[in-house]
Amino acid sequence: EAGARVQQNVPSGTDTGDPQSKPLGDWAAGTMDPESSIFIEDAIKYFKEKVSTQNLLLLLTDNEAWNGFVAAAELPRNEADELRKALDNLARQMIMKDKNWHDKGQQYRNWFLKEFPRLKSELEDNIRRLRALADGVQKVHKGTTIANVVSGSLSISSGILTLVGMGLAPFTEGGSLVLLEPGMELGITAALTGITSSTMDYGKKWWTQAQAHDLVIKSLDKLKEVREFLGENISNFLSLAGNTYQLTRGIGKDIRALRRARANLQSVPHASASRPRVTEPISAESGEQVERVNEPSILEMSRGVKLTDVAPVGFFLVLDVVYLVYESKHLHEGAKSETAEELKKVAQELEEKLNMLNNNYKILQADQEL
Protein backbone atom coordinates (compact mmCIF):
# COMPACT_ATOMS: atom_id res chain seq x y z
CA GLU A 1 0.00 0.00 0.00
CA ALA A 2 1.37 3.40 -0.90
CA GLY A 3 2.22 5.47 2.09
CA ALA A 4 1.33 8.84 0.73
CA ARG A 5 -1.76 10.79 -0.13
CA VAL A 6 -1.71 13.29 -2.96
CA GLN A 7 -3.79 16.37 -3.18
CA GLN A 8 -3.92 19.04 -5.82
CA ASN A 9 -5.16 22.32 -4.51
CA VAL A 10 -6.76 24.43 -7.20
CA PRO A 11 -4.30 27.28 -7.53
CA SER A 12 -5.53 30.81 -7.51
CA GLY A 13 -3.61 33.89 -8.42
CA THR A 14 -3.26 34.75 -4.78
CA ASP A 15 -3.23 31.56 -2.79
CA THR A 16 -4.17 32.20 0.78
CA GLY A 17 -2.85 30.47 3.79
CA ASP A 18 -6.36 30.41 5.17
CA PRO A 19 -8.93 30.20 2.38
CA GLN A 20 -11.80 30.40 4.83
CA SER A 21 -10.68 33.61 6.44
CA LYS A 22 -12.25 36.05 3.98
CA PRO A 23 -15.84 36.79 3.11
CA LEU A 24 -16.98 35.38 -0.21
CA GLY A 25 -17.02 38.66 -2.05
CA ASP A 26 -13.59 39.68 -0.85
CA TRP A 27 -11.59 37.49 -3.24
CA ALA A 28 -9.99 40.47 -4.92
CA ALA A 29 -9.61 42.49 -1.74
CA GLY A 30 -6.81 44.95 -1.56
CA THR A 31 -6.42 45.29 -5.31
CA MET A 32 -9.82 46.31 -6.60
CA ASP A 33 -12.73 48.51 -5.74
CA PRO A 34 -16.22 46.98 -5.37
CA GLU A 35 -17.31 48.20 -8.82
CA SER A 36 -14.40 46.47 -10.50
CA SER A 37 -15.09 43.35 -8.49
CA ILE A 38 -18.70 43.26 -9.69
CA PHE A 39 -17.51 43.78 -13.26
CA ILE A 40 -15.17 40.79 -12.92
CA GLU A 41 -18.11 38.68 -11.77
CA ASP A 42 -20.10 39.81 -14.79
CA ALA A 43 -17.18 39.04 -17.10
CA ILE A 44 -16.77 35.56 -15.63
CA LYS A 45 -20.47 34.90 -16.09
CA TYR A 46 -20.09 35.90 -19.74
CA PHE A 47 -17.12 33.59 -20.27
CA LYS A 48 -18.92 30.70 -18.57
CA GLU A 49 -21.97 31.05 -20.76
CA LYS A 50 -20.57 32.20 -24.07
CA VAL A 51 -16.95 31.10 -24.54
CA SER A 52 -15.78 27.55 -25.15
CA THR A 53 -13.00 25.86 -23.21
CA GLN A 54 -10.84 25.85 -26.33
CA ASN A 55 -11.26 29.56 -26.93
CA LEU A 56 -10.69 30.41 -23.30
CA LEU A 57 -7.48 28.37 -23.33
CA LEU A 58 -6.41 30.15 -26.49
CA LEU A 59 -6.84 33.44 -24.71
CA LEU A 60 -4.82 32.23 -21.74
CA THR A 61 -2.03 30.51 -23.68
CA ASP A 62 -1.41 32.96 -26.48
CA ASN A 63 0.19 36.15 -25.26
CA GLU A 64 -0.73 38.03 -28.41
CA ALA A 65 -4.34 36.90 -28.13
CA TRP A 66 -4.50 38.02 -24.51
CA ASN A 67 -2.97 41.41 -25.26
CA GLY A 68 -5.38 41.86 -28.16
CA PHE A 69 -8.28 40.99 -25.91
CA VAL A 70 -7.17 43.40 -23.17
CA ALA A 71 -6.75 46.18 -25.73
CA ALA A 72 -10.14 45.55 -27.31
CA ALA A 73 -11.80 45.39 -23.91
CA GLU A 74 -10.00 48.59 -22.85
CA LEU A 75 -9.21 47.06 -19.50
CA PRO A 76 -7.01 48.90 -17.00
CA ARG A 77 -3.99 46.91 -15.85
CA ASN A 78 -5.33 46.00 -12.41
CA GLU A 79 -8.65 44.75 -13.81
CA ALA A 80 -6.88 42.79 -16.55
CA ASP A 81 -4.69 41.10 -13.92
CA GLU A 82 -7.64 40.22 -11.72
CA LEU A 83 -9.68 38.98 -14.66
CA ARG A 84 -6.75 36.83 -15.72
CA LYS A 85 -6.60 35.17 -12.29
CA ALA A 86 -10.32 34.50 -12.34
CA LEU A 87 -10.17 33.13 -15.90
CA ASP A 88 -7.32 30.81 -14.94
CA ASN A 89 -9.60 29.32 -12.34
CA LEU A 90 -12.56 29.24 -14.70
CA ALA A 91 -10.51 27.32 -17.26
CA ARG A 92 -9.63 24.75 -14.64
CA GLN A 93 -13.28 24.46 -13.70
CA MET A 94 -14.37 24.05 -17.32
CA ILE A 95 -11.73 21.36 -17.83
CA MET A 96 -13.04 19.53 -14.77
CA LYS A 97 -16.57 19.50 -16.16
CA ASP A 98 -15.57 18.27 -19.60
CA LYS A 99 -15.29 14.51 -20.16
CA ASN A 100 -12.99 15.01 -23.16
CA TRP A 101 -10.57 17.02 -21.07
CA HIS A 102 -10.71 14.37 -18.36
CA ASP A 103 -9.63 11.69 -20.82
CA LYS A 104 -6.96 13.89 -22.36
CA GLY A 105 -5.65 14.84 -18.93
CA GLN A 106 -5.11 11.17 -18.16
CA GLN A 107 -3.44 10.61 -21.51
CA TYR A 108 -1.07 13.56 -21.05
CA ARG A 109 -0.28 12.56 -17.51
CA ASN A 110 0.56 8.99 -18.46
CA TRP A 111 2.80 10.19 -21.26
CA PHE A 112 4.53 12.69 -19.01
CA LEU A 113 5.12 10.14 -16.25
CA LYS A 114 6.61 7.73 -18.75
CA GLU A 115 8.78 10.19 -20.64
CA PHE A 116 9.85 12.74 -18.06
CA PRO A 117 12.67 10.76 -16.38
CA ARG A 118 14.52 10.38 -19.67
CA LEU A 119 13.83 13.93 -20.78
CA LYS A 120 14.89 15.21 -17.38
CA SER A 121 18.17 13.36 -17.68
CA GLU A 122 18.82 14.85 -21.11
CA LEU A 123 17.90 18.34 -19.96
CA GLU A 124 20.17 18.01 -16.92
CA ASP A 125 22.93 17.12 -19.33
CA ASN A 126 22.14 20.18 -21.42
CA ILE A 127 22.29 22.43 -18.38
CA ARG A 128 25.64 20.93 -17.35
CA ARG A 129 26.99 21.50 -20.83
CA LEU A 130 25.77 25.07 -20.91
CA ARG A 131 27.68 25.66 -17.70
CA ALA A 132 30.74 24.04 -19.21
CA LEU A 133 30.30 26.26 -22.24
CA ALA A 134 30.21 29.32 -19.99
CA ASP A 135 33.33 28.14 -18.18
CA GLY A 136 35.09 27.53 -21.48
CA VAL A 137 34.33 31.02 -22.69
CA GLN A 138 35.30 32.54 -19.36
CA LYS A 139 38.70 30.88 -19.44
CA VAL A 140 39.47 32.37 -22.85
CA HIS A 141 38.31 35.89 -22.21
CA LYS A 142 36.00 37.15 -19.51
CA GLY A 143 34.21 39.63 -21.72
CA THR A 144 33.87 37.42 -24.78
CA THR A 145 30.56 37.89 -26.57
CA ILE A 146 28.62 34.64 -26.68
CA ALA A 147 25.18 36.04 -27.31
CA ASN A 148 24.68 34.09 -30.50
CA VAL A 149 25.47 30.76 -28.94
CA VAL A 150 23.29 31.49 -25.97
CA SER A 151 20.29 32.68 -27.92
CA GLY A 152 20.58 29.58 -30.04
CA SER A 153 20.92 27.04 -27.29
CA LEU A 154 18.94 28.52 -24.44
CA SER A 155 15.84 29.65 -26.22
CA ILE A 156 15.34 26.11 -27.37
CA SER A 157 16.16 24.71 -23.93
CA SER A 158 13.69 26.94 -22.15
CA GLY A 159 11.13 26.12 -24.79
CA ILE A 160 11.63 22.44 -24.20
CA LEU A 161 11.50 22.83 -20.46
CA THR A 162 8.17 24.52 -20.66
CA LEU A 163 6.78 22.21 -23.32
CA VAL A 164 8.13 18.93 -22.14
CA GLY A 165 7.57 19.86 -18.56
CA MET A 166 4.08 18.54 -18.20
CA GLY A 167 4.05 16.71 -21.46
CA LEU A 168 1.16 18.62 -22.89
CA ALA A 169 1.78 22.10 -24.18
CA PRO A 170 -0.88 23.09 -26.70
CA PHE A 171 1.32 22.83 -29.76
CA THR A 172 -0.37 22.51 -33.13
CA GLU A 173 0.44 23.37 -36.69
CA GLY A 174 -1.60 25.89 -38.63
CA GLY A 175 -1.09 28.71 -36.19
CA SER A 176 -3.35 27.40 -33.45
CA LEU A 177 -1.63 27.31 -30.10
CA VAL A 178 2.04 27.46 -30.90
CA LEU A 179 3.98 28.43 -27.80
CA LEU A 180 7.41 28.58 -29.41
CA GLU A 181 8.43 31.39 -31.68
CA PRO A 182 7.91 30.73 -35.40
CA GLY A 183 11.15 30.16 -37.24
CA MET A 184 13.02 29.50 -34.04
CA GLU A 185 14.68 26.41 -35.43
CA LEU A 186 16.03 28.42 -38.33
CA GLY A 187 17.28 31.02 -35.91
CA ILE A 188 19.08 28.39 -33.90
CA THR A 189 20.75 26.93 -36.95
CA ALA A 190 21.89 30.39 -37.94
CA ALA A 191 23.17 31.03 -34.44
CA LEU A 192 25.52 28.09 -34.68
CA THR A 193 27.63 29.97 -37.17
CA GLY A 194 27.60 33.16 -35.16
CA ILE A 195 30.50 32.75 -32.74
CA THR A 196 33.15 35.23 -33.75
CA SER A 197 35.66 36.91 -31.50
CA SER A 198 39.15 38.06 -32.13
CA THR A 199 40.05 37.19 -28.56
CA MET A 200 39.25 33.50 -29.05
CA ASP A 201 41.84 31.30 -30.66
CA TYR A 202 40.64 28.97 -33.36
CA GLY A 203 40.78 25.83 -31.21
CA LYS A 204 38.68 27.33 -28.45
CA LYS A 205 36.25 28.77 -30.97
CA TRP A 206 35.86 25.38 -32.60
CA TRP A 207 35.33 23.71 -29.20
CA THR A 208 32.66 26.18 -28.13
CA GLN A 209 30.94 25.97 -31.49
CA ALA A 210 30.97 22.17 -31.42
CA GLN A 211 29.56 22.10 -27.92
CA ALA A 212 26.78 24.52 -28.79
CA HIS A 213 26.01 22.66 -31.99
CA ASP A 214 25.76 19.33 -30.20
CA LEU A 215 23.59 20.79 -27.48
CA VAL A 216 21.21 22.45 -29.91
CA ILE A 217 20.92 19.45 -32.21
CA LYS A 218 20.03 17.21 -29.25
CA SER A 219 17.50 19.75 -28.03
CA LEU A 220 15.94 19.98 -31.47
CA ASP A 221 15.64 16.20 -31.56
CA LYS A 222 13.75 16.32 -28.29
CA LEU A 223 11.54 19.12 -29.52
CA LYS A 224 10.74 17.06 -32.59
CA GLU A 225 9.82 14.10 -30.40
CA VAL A 226 7.55 16.17 -28.19
CA ARG A 227 6.09 17.92 -31.19
CA GLU A 228 5.21 14.63 -32.82
CA PHE A 229 3.47 13.38 -29.70
CA LEU A 230 1.58 16.61 -29.23
CA GLY A 231 0.78 16.94 -32.90
CA GLU A 232 -0.90 13.53 -32.95
CA ASN A 233 -2.83 14.01 -29.74
CA ILE A 234 -3.80 17.63 -29.43
CA SER A 235 -4.18 19.26 -32.82
CA ASN A 236 -7.77 18.19 -33.36
CA PHE A 237 -8.78 18.73 -29.78
CA LEU A 238 -7.53 22.28 -29.61
CA SER A 239 -8.36 23.30 -33.15
CA LEU A 240 -9.80 26.77 -33.22
CA ALA A 241 -12.91 28.00 -34.92
CA GLY A 242 -12.41 31.04 -37.07
CA ASN A 243 -9.73 33.66 -36.96
CA THR A 244 -7.84 34.17 -33.73
CA TYR A 245 -7.66 37.91 -34.25
CA GLN A 246 -11.38 38.27 -34.81
CA LEU A 247 -12.18 35.91 -31.97
CA THR A 248 -10.13 37.71 -29.32
CA ARG A 249 -11.17 41.17 -30.50
CA GLY A 250 -14.78 40.03 -30.58
CA ILE A 251 -14.67 38.78 -26.99
CA GLY A 252 -12.80 41.93 -26.04
CA LYS A 253 -15.53 44.14 -27.49
CA ASP A 254 -18.19 42.21 -25.63
CA ILE A 255 -16.31 42.64 -22.38
CA ARG A 256 -15.84 46.34 -23.09
CA ALA A 257 -19.60 46.69 -23.60
CA LEU A 258 -20.18 44.75 -20.40
CA ARG A 259 -17.80 46.98 -18.50
CA ARG A 260 -19.42 50.15 -19.77
CA ALA A 261 -22.87 48.84 -19.03
CA ARG A 262 -21.78 47.97 -15.52
CA ALA A 263 -20.26 51.43 -15.06
CA ASN A 264 -23.52 53.03 -16.19
CA LEU A 265 -25.55 50.84 -13.87
CA GLN A 266 -23.36 51.77 -10.92
CA SER A 267 -24.41 55.38 -11.33
CA VAL A 268 -28.12 54.48 -11.10
CA PRO A 269 -29.47 53.89 -7.56
CA HIS A 270 -30.57 50.29 -6.79
CA ALA A 271 -29.60 49.15 -10.26
CA SER A 272 -26.89 46.75 -9.25
CA ALA A 273 -29.30 43.84 -8.93
CA SER A 274 -29.92 43.78 -12.65
CA ARG A 275 -27.23 42.44 -14.94
CA PRO A 276 -26.45 44.16 -18.23
CA ARG A 277 -27.37 42.11 -21.28
CA VAL A 278 -24.67 41.81 -23.88
CA THR A 279 -25.95 41.67 -27.43
CA GLU A 280 -24.56 39.29 -30.05
CA PRO A 281 -21.94 37.62 -27.90
CA ILE A 282 -19.13 35.56 -29.38
CA SER A 283 -20.50 32.06 -29.01
CA ALA A 284 -18.71 28.84 -28.35
CA GLU A 285 -17.59 26.81 -31.37
CA SER A 286 -20.37 26.61 -33.93
CA GLY A 287 -23.28 24.67 -32.54
CA GLU A 288 -21.44 23.78 -29.34
CA GLN A 289 -23.23 24.26 -26.05
CA VAL A 290 -20.97 25.01 -23.14
CA GLU A 291 -22.24 23.44 -19.95
CA ARG A 292 -23.16 26.01 -17.33
CA VAL A 293 -20.91 25.52 -14.37
CA ASN A 294 -22.65 26.25 -11.09
CA GLU A 295 -20.79 24.66 -8.20
CA PRO A 296 -18.35 25.46 -6.83
CA SER A 297 -18.44 29.11 -7.82
CA ILE A 298 -15.48 30.91 -9.33
CA LEU A 299 -15.37 33.10 -6.27
CA GLU A 300 -14.98 30.06 -4.06
CA MET A 301 -12.28 28.68 -6.31
CA SER A 302 -10.49 32.00 -6.24
CA ARG A 303 -10.37 31.69 -2.49
CA GLY A 304 -8.45 28.44 -2.72
CA VAL A 305 -11.19 25.87 -2.15
CA LYS A 306 -9.76 22.38 -2.62
CA LEU A 307 -11.44 20.16 -5.18
CA THR A 308 -9.49 17.04 -4.40
CA ASP A 309 -12.51 14.78 -4.37
CA VAL A 310 -13.73 16.00 -7.71
CA ALA A 311 -10.61 16.48 -9.78
CA PRO A 312 -7.60 14.27 -10.39
CA VAL A 313 -4.28 16.10 -10.48
CA GLY A 314 -3.98 15.60 -14.24
CA PHE A 315 -6.81 17.99 -14.96
CA PHE A 316 -4.72 21.00 -14.21
CA LEU A 317 -1.60 20.11 -16.12
CA VAL A 318 -2.41 22.07 -19.22
CA LEU A 319 -2.69 25.32 -17.31
CA ASP A 320 0.42 24.66 -15.29
CA VAL A 321 2.33 24.42 -18.54
CA VAL A 322 0.82 27.72 -19.58
CA TYR A 323 2.01 29.36 -16.39
CA LEU A 324 5.51 27.98 -16.85
CA VAL A 325 5.58 29.36 -20.37
CA TYR A 326 4.56 32.80 -19.17
CA GLU A 327 7.12 32.70 -16.40
CA SER A 328 9.80 31.78 -18.93
CA LYS A 329 9.68 35.11 -20.71
CA HIS A 330 12.68 36.44 -18.82
CA LEU A 331 14.60 33.29 -19.74
CA HIS A 332 14.11 34.12 -23.39
CA GLU A 333 15.38 37.62 -22.68
CA GLY A 334 18.26 36.15 -20.70
CA ALA A 335 19.14 34.12 -23.74
CA LYS A 336 20.60 37.27 -25.25
CA SER A 337 23.24 37.32 -22.50
CA GLU A 338 26.70 38.25 -23.67
CA THR A 339 29.05 37.17 -20.90
CA ALA A 340 29.86 33.87 -19.27
CA GLU A 341 28.54 35.22 -15.97
CA GLU A 342 25.18 36.05 -17.48
CA LEU A 343 25.04 32.67 -19.15
CA LYS A 344 25.58 30.97 -15.80
CA LYS A 345 22.67 32.92 -14.37
CA VAL A 346 20.43 31.81 -17.21
CA ALA A 347 21.59 28.22 -16.74
CA GLN A 348 20.67 28.52 -13.07
CA GLU A 349 17.21 29.78 -13.99
CA LEU A 350 16.80 26.88 -16.37
CA GLU A 351 17.81 24.55 -13.58
CA GLU A 352 15.15 26.09 -11.35
CA LYS A 353 12.60 25.66 -14.13
CA LEU A 354 13.51 22.00 -14.40
CA ASN A 355 13.19 21.74 -10.62
CA MET A 356 9.64 23.07 -10.81
CA LEU A 357 8.77 20.52 -13.46
CA ASN A 358 10.36 17.81 -11.37
CA ASN A 359 8.29 18.86 -8.36
CA ASN A 360 5.16 18.37 -10.44
CA TYR A 361 6.43 15.02 -11.66
CA LYS A 362 6.95 13.76 -8.11
CA ILE A 363 3.43 14.76 -7.14
CA LEU A 364 1.93 13.08 -10.20
CA GLN A 365 4.02 10.01 -9.52
CA ALA A 366 2.79 9.82 -5.95
CA ASP A 367 -0.78 10.24 -7.19
CA GLN A 368 -0.32 7.28 -9.51
CA GLU A 369 0.98 5.11 -6.67
CA LEU A 370 -2.28 5.46 -4.77
Partner: antibody, heavy 121, light 106 residues
Protein backbone atom coordinates in the same frame (compact mmCIF):
# COMPACT_ATOMS: atom_id res chain seq x y z
CA UNK B 1 20.75 34.44 2.10
CA UNK B 2 18.15 31.68 2.26
CA UNK B 3 16.09 31.78 5.46
CA UNK B 4 13.11 29.83 6.73
CA UNK B 5 11.41 31.46 9.72
CA UNK B 6 8.68 29.71 11.71
CA UNK B 7 6.03 31.09 14.04
CA UNK B 8 6.44 30.87 17.80
CA UNK B 9 5.60 28.12 20.32
CA UNK B 10 1.99 27.18 20.96
CA UNK B 11 0.09 25.86 23.94
CA UNK B 12 -3.28 24.52 22.81
CA UNK B 13 -6.18 22.62 24.34
CA UNK B 14 -7.14 19.09 23.27
CA UNK B 15 -9.68 19.07 20.45
CA UNK B 16 -8.60 22.46 19.16
CA UNK B 17 -6.90 23.17 15.83
CA UNK B 18 -3.95 25.41 15.13
CA UNK B 19 -1.86 26.74 12.28
CA UNK B 20 1.94 27.11 12.12
CA UNK B 21 3.48 29.49 9.60
CA UNK B 22 6.81 29.24 7.81
CA UNK B 23 8.06 32.33 6.00
CA UNK B 24 10.70 31.81 3.34
CA UNK B 25 13.10 34.46 2.08
CA UNK B 26 16.27 34.74 0.03
CA UNK B 27 15.12 32.56 -2.85
CA UNK B 28 12.29 32.10 -5.34
CA UNK B 29 9.53 30.56 -3.25
CA UNK B 30 7.72 28.78 -6.10
CA UNK B 31 10.79 26.90 -7.30
CA UNK B 32 11.26 24.63 -4.28
CA UNK B 33 8.88 22.39 -2.39
CA UNK B 34 8.30 22.91 1.32
CA UNK B 35 8.36 19.87 3.61
CA UNK B 36 6.96 19.54 7.11
CA UNK B 37 8.53 17.24 9.69
CA UNK B 38 7.37 16.27 13.20
CA UNK B 39 9.87 15.51 15.95
CA UNK B 40 8.49 13.96 19.12
CA UNK B 41 10.39 13.85 22.41
CA UNK B 42 13.50 15.30 20.76
CA UNK B 43 14.04 12.03 18.95
CA UNK B 44 12.18 10.49 16.01
CA UNK B 45 11.69 12.54 12.85
CA UNK B 46 8.47 11.91 10.94
CA UNK B 47 7.69 13.38 7.55
CA UNK B 48 4.21 14.90 7.40
CA UNK B 49 4.24 15.82 3.74
CA UNK B 50 5.24 18.45 1.24
CA UNK B 51 3.63 21.19 -0.80
CA UNK B 52 4.63 22.59 -4.17
CA UNK B 53 4.15 26.36 -3.75
CA UNK B 54 3.97 26.80 -7.52
CA UNK B 55 0.55 25.20 -7.85
CA UNK B 56 -0.48 24.00 -4.42
CA UNK B 57 0.09 20.33 -5.23
CA UNK B 58 0.72 18.25 -2.12
CA UNK B 59 1.89 14.82 -1.04
CA UNK B 60 0.92 13.66 2.44
CA UNK B 61 2.23 10.84 4.57
CA UNK B 62 -0.86 8.67 5.02
CA UNK B 63 -0.31 8.65 8.75
CA UNK B 64 -1.16 12.35 8.84
CA UNK B 65 -4.24 12.18 6.63
CA UNK B 66 -6.99 14.12 8.35
CA UNK B 67 -4.55 15.45 10.91
CA UNK B 68 -2.52 17.92 8.83
CA UNK B 69 -3.38 20.34 6.04
CA UNK B 70 -0.66 22.08 4.02
CA UNK B 71 -1.26 25.39 2.27
CA UNK B 72 0.79 28.28 0.91
CA UNK B 73 0.42 31.99 0.36
CA UNK B 74 2.59 32.80 -2.63
CA UNK B 75 2.19 36.54 -2.20
CA UNK B 76 3.95 36.45 1.17
CA UNK B 77 6.18 33.42 0.46
CA UNK B 78 4.67 31.65 3.44
CA UNK B 79 3.80 27.99 3.94
CA UNK B 80 1.32 26.84 6.55
CA UNK B 81 0.75 23.64 8.48
CA UNK B 82 -2.68 23.32 10.05
CA UNK B 83 -3.10 20.64 12.70
CA UNK B 84 -6.63 19.47 13.39
CA UNK B 85 -8.37 17.94 16.43
CA UNK B 86 -5.28 18.04 18.57
CA UNK B 87 -4.47 15.41 21.19
CA UNK B 88 -1.49 14.93 23.50
CA UNK B 89 0.06 12.70 20.80
CA UNK B 90 0.44 15.82 18.65
CA UNK B 91 2.71 17.51 21.19
CA UNK B 92 6.01 17.85 19.37
CA UNK B 93 8.35 20.21 17.58
CA UNK B 94 7.26 20.84 13.98
CA UNK B 95 9.79 21.86 11.35
CA UNK B 96 9.34 23.23 7.88
CA UNK B 97 12.22 22.49 5.54
CA UNK B 98 12.87 23.46 1.95
CA UNK B 99 13.15 20.62 -0.56
CA UNK B 100 16.56 20.58 -2.24
CA UNK B 101 17.08 20.78 -6.01
CA UNK B 102 16.15 17.75 -8.11
CA UNK B 103 19.68 16.39 -8.16
CA UNK B 104 19.36 15.68 -4.43
CA UNK B 105 15.76 14.59 -4.62
CA UNK B 106 14.03 14.20 -1.28
CA UNK B 107 16.72 16.05 0.65
CA UNK B 108 15.87 19.11 2.74
CA UNK B 109 18.51 21.80 2.53
CA UNK B 110 17.20 24.63 4.73
CA UNK B 111 15.27 24.06 7.94
CA UNK B 112 13.19 26.39 10.07
CA UNK B 113 14.02 26.77 13.74
CA UNK B 114 11.07 24.58 14.72
CA UNK B 115 7.77 25.37 16.40
CA UNK B 116 7.06 23.70 19.72
CA UNK B 117 3.45 22.63 20.15
CA UNK B 118 2.17 21.49 23.53
CA UNK B 119 -1.35 20.08 23.75
CA UNK B 120 -2.64 20.27 27.28
CA UNK B 121 -5.81 21.11 29.10
CA UNK C 1 6.76 2.03 3.58
CA UNK C 2 10.54 1.72 3.69
CA UNK C 3 11.88 1.42 7.23
CA UNK C 4 15.38 2.73 7.90
CA UNK C 5 17.20 1.10 10.83
CA UNK C 6 20.29 2.86 12.20
CA UNK C 7 23.11 1.07 14.01
CA UNK C 8 24.30 1.51 16.61
CA UNK C 9 21.70 3.59 18.42
CA UNK C 10 24.44 5.10 20.56
CA UNK C 11 28.08 5.30 19.49
CA UNK C 12 30.75 6.30 21.95
CA UNK C 13 34.31 6.97 20.75
CA UNK C 14 37.44 8.97 21.57
CA UNK C 15 38.75 12.01 19.67
CA UNK C 16 40.95 10.99 16.74
CA UNK C 17 39.23 7.64 16.30
CA UNK C 18 37.62 6.49 13.07
CA UNK C 19 33.91 5.80 13.49
CA UNK C 20 31.27 4.36 11.19
CA UNK C 21 27.51 4.30 11.58
CA UNK C 22 25.14 2.28 9.43
CA UNK C 23 21.70 2.85 7.91
CA UNK C 24 19.86 -0.28 6.70
CA UNK C 25 16.75 -0.04 4.55
CA UNK C 26 13.94 -2.60 4.54
CA UNK C 27 13.92 -2.34 0.72
CA UNK C 28 16.53 -1.15 -1.72
CA UNK C 29 16.85 2.63 -1.97
CA UNK C 30 18.54 4.70 -4.65
CA UNK C 31 20.39 6.77 -2.09
CA UNK C 32 20.11 8.21 1.40
CA UNK C 33 20.64 11.69 2.80
CA UNK C 34 22.21 12.27 6.21
CA UNK C 35 21.45 15.03 8.72
CA UNK C 36 23.24 16.16 11.85
CA UNK C 37 21.22 17.44 14.80
CA UNK C 38 22.56 18.92 18.01
CA UNK C 39 20.38 19.35 21.12
CA UNK C 40 18.08 22.36 20.89
CA UNK C 41 18.81 22.90 17.19
CA UNK C 42 17.20 22.01 13.87
CA UNK C 43 18.61 19.18 11.78
CA UNK C 44 21.27 20.26 9.29
CA UNK C 45 21.88 18.60 5.92
CA UNK C 46 25.15 16.74 6.24
CA UNK C 47 25.54 14.34 3.32
CA UNK C 48 23.40 14.39 0.16
CA UNK C 49 22.68 11.42 -2.07
CA UNK C 50 24.81 8.90 -0.16
CA UNK C 51 28.20 10.56 -0.64
CA UNK C 52 28.03 14.31 -1.37
CA UNK C 53 29.05 16.50 1.56
CA UNK C 54 26.79 19.48 2.25
CA UNK C 55 28.32 22.94 2.23
CA UNK C 56 30.58 23.56 5.23
CA UNK C 57 30.85 19.90 6.28
CA UNK C 58 34.45 18.93 7.14
CA UNK C 59 36.23 16.60 4.75
CA UNK C 60 36.76 14.05 7.53
CA UNK C 61 33.15 13.01 6.93
CA UNK C 62 32.29 10.63 4.12
CA UNK C 63 29.29 8.60 3.02
CA UNK C 64 28.97 5.40 1.04
CA UNK C 65 26.64 2.55 0.29
CA UNK C 66 24.04 1.23 -2.11
CA UNK C 67 20.86 -0.82 -2.11
CA UNK C 68 19.85 -1.57 1.45
CA UNK C 69 23.09 -0.71 3.24
CA UNK C 70 24.50 2.80 3.65
CA UNK C 71 27.02 4.26 6.04
CA UNK C 72 28.49 7.51 7.34
CA UNK C 73 32.16 7.52 8.38
CA UNK C 74 34.24 10.05 10.31
CA UNK C 75 37.93 9.47 9.68
CA UNK C 76 39.19 11.34 12.77
CA UNK C 77 36.58 12.13 15.40
CA UNK C 78 36.52 15.62 16.92
CA UNK C 79 34.62 16.94 19.92
CA UNK C 80 32.39 19.13 17.75
CA UNK C 81 31.03 16.01 16.02
CA UNK C 82 28.93 15.17 19.08
CA UNK C 83 25.38 15.02 17.75
CA UNK C 84 22.64 12.70 16.55
CA UNK C 85 22.87 11.66 12.90
CA UNK C 86 19.77 10.68 10.93
CA UNK C 87 19.55 8.98 7.56
CA UNK C 88 16.59 9.62 5.25
CA UNK C 89 15.21 8.17 2.01
CA UNK C 90 12.66 9.15 -0.60
CA UNK C 91 12.97 6.29 -3.06
CA UNK C 92 9.33 5.59 -2.34
CA UNK C 93 6.52 7.31 -0.50
CA UNK C 94 6.32 8.20 2.25
CA UNK C 95 9.68 9.82 2.83
CA UNK C 96 11.16 8.22 5.96
CA UNK C 97 13.94 8.87 8.47
CA UNK C 98 15.98 6.45 10.53
CA UNK C 99 15.71 6.61 14.33
CA UNK C 100 19.16 8.18 14.54
CA UNK C 101 22.61 7.33 15.86
CA UNK C 102 23.68 9.37 18.87
CA UNK C 103 27.42 10.01 18.71
CA UNK C 104 29.14 10.69 22.03
CA UNK C 105 32.72 11.60 22.72
CA UNK C 106 34.46 9.65 25.48
Amino acid sequence: EVQVQQSGPELVKPGASMKISCKASGYSFIVYTMNWVKQSHGKNLEWIGLINPYNGGTIYNRKFKGKATLTVDKSSSTAYLELLSLTSEDSAVYYCARGALYRYEGAMDYWGQGTSVIVSS
Amino acid sequence: QIVLSQFPAILSASPGEKVTMTCRASSSVIYVHWYQQKPGSSPKPWIYATSNLASGVPARFSGSGSGTSHSLTISRLEAEDTATYYCQQWSSNPLTFGAGTKLEIK
